[in-house]
């Protein structure tokens, strides 16, 4: 029976050009984490394997850094990075746990003035 739960950083709104950290944490289970995959839509960004360590997909190597911990750092954010990210924990004997984080990357003009939001 799968008793674990995944806690995430929560959804993030960030500005174009900045960097953010995506993190998940698996709790409430004694299962062993064998591998953590980070994916966006259907693309694999990175893998952290308990034995083999980190592998970053070649197409993301210049903007994705491993860590901290089992998390992932995204740098030089673009509007195209807006989307849903998944941390997929492969565990034994429980199986797979998945966390979801949505990243909203705003153009600088939107972040500063957009949507006629007023901040008192």
């Amino acid at each position: 029976m799968m008793t674990g739960t995944i806690e995430t950083t929560g959804n993030i709104s960030a500005e174009k050009g900045g960097s953010i950290i995506l993190q998940c944490h698996l709790s409430s289970t004694t299962a062993q984490v064998t591998q953590v995959n980070w994916e966006q839509q259907d693309q694999l960004l990175a893998i952290c394997n308990a034995d083999l360590g980190w592998h970053i997909s070649p197409s993301f190597k210049d903007r994705v850094a491993p860590g901290p911990g089992l998390g992932l750092t995204l740098q030089s954010l673009t509007v195209n990075d807006t989307g849903e990210y998944f941390c997929i924990y492969h565990t034994y004997p429980d199986g797979t746990y998945t966390g979801r984080i949505f990243l909203e990357v705003l153009e600088s003009s939107v972040a500063e003035h957009g949507a006629r939001f007023q901040i008192p």
Epitope: T9, G10, N11, S13, T82, G83, E84, L106, G114, P120
Partner: antibody
């Protein structure tokens, strides 16, 4: 002025599919996420999913996976939601809403969908 | 999914009253950067919902200052200082910090 103009009310038969449109104006369509939300009669609001018009990326509420498909046409600044295999449970008012900092700042006028034989 | 509980379900008021609506979430709505994505909406009969407050306490453009939001973590409040006829309707809170976003069940503000 930001506006989201939705297509008109629909009466459809059980088992049929249909598509609702949401035409955006007054802002840069590709610069903001578009959400879809529904309200069944006498119930609260439910988030269906979202689409990023910039790259077509989507995120769905698990409850609506296989029920709703979200697409956009950038050339006409229009978002679409196709509803599949409709049942009476899908009778509701459906809204498109613009997202900014995870708040829904502008809403379409709503599209009433009635599923009945 | 994060469960959002609104109280009360119904709030009978007289014009000029001050009222509070509570919204509680099953887990903290603060993300790792300290941002909390909690917003409030008013849904009037025959209209679309409209944004009142975003990010706990920021009033959206054009929203009168009789509306104010407060709270942190899992516990949030919308206050309306002097009820006017145009304030009647259903109020909803929305958490946008965790996927999927979830709405509260709503609070109906109606005349006594």
């Amino acid at each position: 002025e930001v506006q989201l103009q939705q297509s008109g009310p629909e009466l459809v038969k059980p088992g049929a599919s249909m598509k609702i449109s949401c035409k955006a104006s007054g802002y840069s369509f590709t610069g903001y996420i578009m959400n879809w939300v529904r309200q069944s009669h006498g119930k609260s609001l439910e988030w269906i999913g979202l689409i990023n018009p910039y790259n077509g990326g989507t995120s769905y509420n698990q409850k609506f996976k296989g029920k709703a498909t979200l697409t956009v046409d950038k050339s006409s600044s229009t978002a679409y939601m196709e509803l599949l295999s409709l049942t009476s449970e899908d009778s509701a008012v459906y809204y498109c809403t613009r997202l900014l900092r995870f708040a829904m700042d502008y809403w379409g006028q709503g599209t009433s969908v009635t599923v009945s034989s | 999914d994060v469960v959002v509980t609104q109280t009360p379900l119904s709030l009978p008021v007289s014009f000029g009253d001050q009222v509070s609506i509570s919204c509680r979430s099953s887990q903290s709505l603060a993300n790792s950067y300290g941002s909390t994505y909690l917003s409030w909406y008013l849904h009037k009969p025959g209209q679309s919902p409209q944004l009142l407050i975003y990010g706990i306490s920021n009033r959206f453009s054009g929203v009168p200052d009789r509306f104010s939001g407060s709270g942190s973590g899992t516990d949030f409040t919308l206050k309306i200082s002097t009820i006017k006829p145009e304030d009647l309707g259903m109020y909803y809170c929305l958490q946008g910090t965790h996927q999927p976003p979830t709405f509260g069940g709503g609070t109906k503000l109606e005349i006594k």
